[in-house]
């Protein structure tokens, strides 16, 4: 029977800068029941606080609701593991909520084949930002990435769309059925999951020349 091994806070994510959750990985348990507590303070403060919510994020997590979340302030946090034989502490983790946003996938993905008479045909892709993200305030800049492939192909073709919410693709294989997905990323932060796939049948007379 031993004191617990050193835990590690390995991930923090926020859906929208208004709340966030951090997760830790326990160390070895030393063969005894182990209690974990997360404590934190904000930069410039000395007062330590305990995690406000150990439930919402699931096992080995701490959730910070709206009243505990402030932007532009670094949180300095650590996890303490304790059993009957002693304690161990994780390294301190510095967290700025602005940098840990992982948005939901973009919404309303629409794909259409456009065949104008006077120009080359193209695939037109359009989407909307995720609802939880407030782009009007200027707090967020979202970047988008599109991926598509013929249904039976193994490799995805990836296009970076920047901040725009629509995109044109010119080079496609006629007669193929394509899968199209889009994802988004804040200027600081993490890529969302890919949106559900939308399928589009490319007409056989779709000419690339």
């Amino acid at each position: 029977q031993l004191p617990p091994g050193k835990p590690e806070i390995f991930k923090c994510r926020s859906p929208n800068k208004e709340t966030f959750t951090c997760w830790w990985r326990p160390g070895t348990d030393g063969g005894l029941p182990t209690n974990y507590s997360l404590t934190y303070h904000r930069e410039g403060e000395t007062l330590m606080h305990e995690c406000p919510d150990y439930i919402t994020g699931g096992p080995n997590s701490c959730h910070f609701g709206k009243q505990y979340t402030s932007m532009w302030r670094t949180y300095i946090m650590m996890v303490n593991a304790t059993n009957q034989m002693g304690s161990s502490f994780s390294d301190e983790l510095y967290v700025d909520v602005t940098y840990i946003v992982q948005p939901d996938p973009p919404l309303e993905l629409a794909v259409e084949v456009k065949q104008p008479e006077d120009r080359k045909p193209y695939l037109w892709i359009k989407w909307s930002p995720p609802t939880l993200i407030d782009l009007k305030t200027g707090w967020f800049t979202l970047l988008y990435e599109i991926r598509l492939k013929p249904e039976k192909a193994a490799e995805w073709e990836i296009h970076f769309a920047g901040q725009q919410t629509e995109f044109k693709i010119l080079s496609l294989h006629p007669g193929q059925k394509y899968l199209v997905q889009v994802r988004c990323k804040p200027d600081h932060g993490y890529w969302s999951a890919w949106s559900p796939a939308t399928f589009i049948q490319i007409p056989s007379d779709f000419t690339m020349n």
């Epitope: 990985r25 510095y94 940098y99 990323k185 993490y190 890529w191």
Partner: antibody, heavy 120, light 107 residues
Amino acid sequence: QVQLVQSGAEVKKPGSSVKVSCKASGYTFTTYWMHWVRQAPGQGLEWMGEIDPSDSYSNYNQKFKDRVTITADKSTSTAYMELSSLRSEDTAVYYCARNGGLGPAWFSYWGQGTLVTVSS
Amino acid sequence: EIVMTQSPATLSVSPGERATLSCKASQYVGTAVAWYQQKPGQSPRLLIYSASNRYTGVPARFSDSGSGTEFTLTISSLQSEDFAVYFCQQYSSYPWTFGGGTKVEIK
């Protein structure tokens, strides 16, 4: 404890490429951005670029944009920096540096440095 | 890019005295400034982040004041281990840039 161990010194010819590695241990590699910074002999520090090892998303200093490639191998917890079209002024110590937290780009852990000498 | 200008290039100080190092940014950077210490043959070591916050384990004799474009690193009472080169760095906008350094030497 956190360690960043870099590959050994290199001597390269002008026009060639060099690839420096940085093996991370003591923490979860995918949690923190990794940066590359260089220091010419007797000179200051120059940031080259950064990578998020969780998804290999990277940003580069425009000065090096066409010549530098930063990659990360999650399976070995190793970051790489490749610099091509080497010239004599690329002679420098190259450092990998780990982001200080989940936040802005200040660097709390540094590798020991890799001296790259470019000489004909 | 934002240019960080450090002065003086060299500062001669006696042990126990106060050292004041200056760093000026060419554009507004708020408090997005870090300070590093580097000794010969070693990698840089983080001292201060967000302009005024000491990193874990950094002695209280190191402090920073300033925001916007002008920053000052103060070492209140120089110890023998403090003689080194000090760099400031901005992380307000890409590319992240460093000052040219101030060498603090024994007077």
